[in-house]
């Protein structure tokens, strides 16, 4: 597959930010702000938490989530999984693209029960027009959103 | 805002590295090496710790800081904040762009007094000509800068 | 050095993924999958763990490794070093490009002896044709590969 950058075309890019509505608790992906503040879409679209590709090519996709808590919620596995997943009309299930597992709860100290940790993912993947990328965090209860600078999701064509 | 890549133009990019002089202790941003070793500026300029934009557009900006210590100094909040901030002539205060909070001190164990942690930030933001981006770490004493490969700051236009 | 993007040229990019054969235990760099699944090479080549540059320029290079364990193997220093290194015909030794140190073993908690951590590196470096970039992890025994989404290595020209 040959992908060319035309000098007269805009390069697709997006940066979506965390918001109060990002955590649904429904088992679905995280939702994102697309317009306010630092958020934007350029040559990509958005639908229910997903970045939707309009132009096929190789994209550097990335996400950061801010994790935090007081100790660890009872019943919460000590592993937090943060991942970028692809949805394609060609398969019924989401496909793992980039994934991290962390054990942040162990970061609480004797002098501070509150802990913070951050997970960053980034990598180049090929995406066809109409394919979607979403962010999932398990367990999402530990994601801290605040102001859109600590948890985010983006992509640009390379 | 339409941003085009002209085929005859160089794409702005920079990678700045940590140096002995990076920590000022003055409450200001981290300072960086711009020329020696792996550091370079191409289509961006530098001033007092800041990458200065000469050409408006969307930029992927990134920073990594290496954190390390023995235990945690008293009076140091257990939270380390690492962030990329924008300075613009249109506002008197810096604007948060990308931020992470970590609790690295809890990583020391009985079998290991010394702990190490790393914080990576990266994301796409829109920057106007003349706007500046800086890196701040609170508490900066725990940042390891010395050799330029462990703490760094960069950007490129997308 | 002026590097231009010609509109008729493909932009070099690659994303290599972890595989069962990645960990050699030989003291060499990690090895990678180059074709199956999410892995690809476009305008870059591969040789014995290394991304080999065919076109000189500035590249954003990145790597993520998934770390995990039960406690810490006896005799293992609590520090894990994850780095991207350059091989060039002009020097006999590898050159550090981007490096992180982590102390992940301290993440095990009283309620969970198993810990997980992730290390991400990314930054822009200049690479000449024929130069190579490799990933090293010390101690590689703690790298968890599984399915190619948790540990990976890539680059693209900026």
């Amino acid at each position: 597959l040959i992908q060319e950058r035309r000098s007269h075309e805009v390069n697709p890019a997006a940066h979506l930010t965390g918001a109060n509505s990002s955590l649904t608790g429904s088992g679905g992906p995280l939702l994102w702000e697309t317009q306010l503040g630092l958020a934007f879409l350029r040559g990509l679209s958005y639908h229910d938490g997903a970045l939707v590709v309009t132009k096929a090519g190789y994209y550097y996709i990335y996400s950061k989530v801010q994790l935090g808590g007081v100790g660890c919620p009872l019943g919460l596995a000590s592993t937090i999984t943060h991942g970028l997943y692809k949805r394609t009309p060609r398969y019924p299930e989401e496909l793992e693209l980039l994934v991290s597992q962390q054990s942040p709860c162990g970061r609480a100290t004797s002098s501070s029960r509150v802990w913070w940790d951050s997970s960053f993912l980034g990598g180049v993947v090929h995406l066809e027009a109409g394919e979607e990328v979403v962010v999932r965090v398990l367990d999402e209860r530990l994601v801290r959103l605040r102001d859109g600078t600590r948890s985010y999701f983006g992509a640009f064509m390379v | 805002l339409i941003q085009e890549r002209r085929s005859h133009e160089v794409n702005p990019a920079a990678h700045l590295t940590g140096a002995n002089s990076s920590l000022t202790g003055s409450g200001g941003p981290l300072l960086w090496e711009t020329q020696l070793g792996l550091a370079f500026l191409r289509g961006l300029s530098y001033h007092d710790g800041a990458l200065v934009v000469t050409k408006a557009g969307y930029y992927y900006i990134y920073s990594k800081v290496q954190l390390g210590g023995v235990g945690c100094p008293l009076g140091l909040a257990s939270t380390i904040t690492h962030g990329l901030y924008k300075r613009t002539p249109r506002y008197p205060e810096e604007l948060e762009l990308l931020v992470s909070q970590q609790s690295p001190c809890g990583r020391a164990t009985s079998s290991s007094r010394v702990w190490w942690d790393s914080s990576f930030l990266g994301g796409v933001v829109h920057l106007e000509a003349g706007e500046e981006v800086v890196v701040r770490v609170l508490d900066e004493r725990l940042v390891r800068l010395r050799d330029g490969t462990r703490s760094y700051f960069g950007a490129f236009m997308v | 050095l002026i590097q231009e993007r010609r509109s008729h040229e493909v932009n070099p990019a690659a994303h290599l993924t972890g595989a069962n054969s990645s960990l050699t235990g030989s003291g060499g760099p990690l090895l990678w999958e180059t074709q199956l699944g999410l892995a690809f090479l476009r305008g870059l080549s591969y040789h014995d763990g290394a991304l080999v540059v065919t076109k000189a320029g500035y590249y954003y290079i990145y790597s993520k490794v998934q770390l995990g364990g039960v406690g810490c193997p006896l005799g293992l220093a609590s520090t894990i070093t994850h780095g991207l290194y350059k091989r060039t015909p002009r020097y006999p030794e590898e050159l550090e490009l981007l490096v992180s140190q982590q102390s992940p073993c301290g993440r095990a908690t009283s309620s969970s002896r198993v810990w997980w951590d992730s290390s991400f590196l990314g930054g822009v470096v200049h690479l000449e044709a024929g130069e190579e970039v490799v990933v090293r992890v010390l101690d590689e025994r703690l790298v968890r590969l599984r399915d190619g989404t948790r540990s990976y290595f890539g680059a693209f020209m900026v």
Epitope: - | G71, P73, G75, L142, R144 | L76, A77
Partner: antibody, heavy 121, light 107 residues
């Protein structure tokens, strides 16, 4: 200037007790781990104990565990070593040392002049 | 406990000589190693920390290297004040331990 001054050494009988003090000046005492190290006559250096800057986490060498107690008073810029059940083999010069643990800077960079403890009947 | 073994235990050299002292740890300590110099009747002085970082004010003739289990202190050109006892010390793991020392004497 940055300085550590030990005091409290002397001659004591086996089974006796002594309390060593270390007065710090010229730096923010509460920012640093503090250590006690000793050196028996004609011998090498032996680490005894340390105390963290942040939460008074303490570790001891096996040779003194249960007999010696390290403590600090950040308000007074002082470090202490309470030594009980002293033995002849505890005879040594006792040093206090400041230890850095910040990103780029590690190691016991400031030592006191030492105070001599002699345990003899 | 981690044992640090220094070699040689003593050596004779002249002013201007290049001297190398080795320190081997019984297990991996990463780069958490320091080197000290102690002259008779004086307190130990920090020379190198983090295996290879030169302490402020210490002459550049002192060079530390190594990581993991094998470390080296090199004095490129011995000066009169360098005739002393040198100790390595690991600060990675409790209990903290010192090497047995290397005595550098005048030939």
């Amino acid at each position: 200037q940055v300085q550590l001054v030990e005091s409290g050494g002397g001659l004591v009988k086996p089974g006796g007790s002594l309390r060593l003090s270390c007065a710090a000046s010229g730096f923010t005492f509460s920012d640093y781990y503090m250590n006690w190290i000793r050196q028996a006559p004609g011998k090498g250096l032996e680490w005894i104990a340390d105390i963290s800057s942040r939460d008074n986490t303490i570790y001891y060498a096996d040779s003194v565990k249960g007999r010696f107690t390290i403590s600090r008073d950040n308000a007074k810029n002082s470090l202490y070593l309470q030594m009980n059940s002293l033995r002849a083999e505890d005879t040594a010069v006792y040093y206090c040392a400041r230890e850095r643990g910040f990103g780029d800077y590690f190691g016991m960079d400031v030592w006191g002049q030492g105070t001599t403890v002699t345990v003899s009947s | 406990a981690i044992q640090l073994t220094q070699s040689p235990s003593s050596l004779s050299a002249s002013v201007g000589d290049r001297v190398t002292i080795a320190c081997r740890a019984s297990q991996d300590i990463s780069s958490a190693l320091a080197w000290f110099r102690q002259t008779p009747g004086k307190t130990p002085k920090l020379l190198i920390y983090d295996a290879s970082s030169l302490e402020s004010g210490v002459p550049s003739r002192f060079l530390g290297s190594g990581s993991g289990t094998d470390f080296t202190l090199t004095i490129s050109s011995l000066q009169p004040e360098d005739f002393a006892i040198y100790y390595c010390q690991q600060f990675n793991t409790y209990p903290l331990t010192f090497g047995g020392g290397t005595k550098v004497e005048i030939k």
